[in-house]
Amino acid sequence: EEELQIIQPDKSVSVAAGESAILHCTITSLFPVGPIQWFRGAGPARVLIYNQRQGPFPRVTTVSETTKRENMDFSISISNITPADAGTYYCIKFRKGSPDTEFKSGAGTELSVRAKPS
């Protein structure tokens, strides 16, 4: 089994308020087994944006079809962006367990929000 890498290709993404933001994340291996989660921010104050094993997350949809058994694309789209959504988003692989434990994080994608065009 190859070592898991988490690829967040975009260092930054800029989106106009009211639009949708696509945050890209691909993994290179299904192992270790466990869910993908997205967070805004780091450390104890980070905010859960999406968790593969639970939901729903009304403003968040996955870009690819995560029900495919071999899926390794966990990019997400966040709708109706507001200035409060600005921040750095991390795609994180968890290892299954009770509870699941954080295994590896992507480098992060900084989302900036532009004013809505008049």
Epitope: L30, F31, P32, V33, P35, Q52, R53, E65, T66, T67, K68, R69, E70, K96, S98
Partner: antibody, heavy 118, light 106 residues
């Protein structure tokens, strides 16, 4: 409430073809992967086939590979299993089941009986 | 293949543990109850330890390494059934089941 109702079971002769259906209600069918699981008389459960939410990707047990086709019509909330070249070993109750995020099962239908008789 | 005991028995009120092994660390496990042959299975546990909201709290699941365990705390007469463990293997994209464990409540 989630409901899965199978139909199409019948008494058939060896070598014939049969199509089973499973009609779903109570959830957003197009968002979930689905599977068929069977149980031969006096035996345990055997996974037969699975399909991704859009229907683009399909998966089969070795015991049916090459002579079975799983498909779905999301506009009709219906899952199908077409089985050809049937043999006595295919005699079983066939259940459709909804998959969880990690391809286990959370809801099951009541089953439909397929009997091979020469 | 997943391995589980063929049968277990217990008195009402006792705690029963049914084990399932052989899935490896690349598997998730689920537990399914079937009260009579040919009747619809009911999911008790999925994702190793997740219990659907309509399942009584006396049923719990756990997994360590390549072994999963279903625990029934305070077994009741109505729990008499066959219990199947099931697994999904990320290396093969295939679901497998154990042969089933018959629980007899004495």
């Amino acid at each position: 409430d989630v409901q899965l109702v199978e139909s199409g079971g019948a008494v058939v002769r060896p070598g014939e073809t049969l199509r089973l259906s499973c009609t779903a209600s109570g959830f957003t069918f197009s968002s979930y992967a689905m599977s068929w699981v069977r149980q031969a008389p006096g035996k345990g459960l055997e996974w037969v086939s699975g399909i991704s939410a859009s229907g683009s990707d399909t998966y089969y047990a070795d015991s049916v590979k090459g002579r079975s086709t799983i498909s779905r019509d999301n506009s009709k909330n219906t899952l199908y299993l077409r089985m050809s070249s049937l043999t006595a070993e295919d005699t079983a109750v066939y259940y459709c089941a909804r998959e969880t995020w990690n391809h286990l099962f959370d809801y099951w239908g009541l089953g439909t009986l397929v009997t091979l008789s020469s | 293949a997943l391995t589980q005991p063929a049968s277990v028995s217990a008195n009402p009120g006792e705690t029963v543990k049914i084990t399932c092994s052989g899935g490896g660390t690349s598997s998730y496990y689920g537990w399914y109850q079937q009260k009579s042959p040919g009747s619809a299975p009911v999911t008790l546990i999925h994702s190793d330890d997740k219990r659907p909201s309509d399942i009584p709290s006396r049923f719990s699941g756990s997994a360590s390494g390549s072994t999963a365990t279903l625990t029934i705390t305070g077994v009741q007469a109505e729990d008499e059934a066959v219990y199947y463990c099931g697994g999904y293997d990320y290396t093969t994209y295939v679901n497998t089941f154990g042969a089933g464990t018959t629980l007899t409540v004495l």
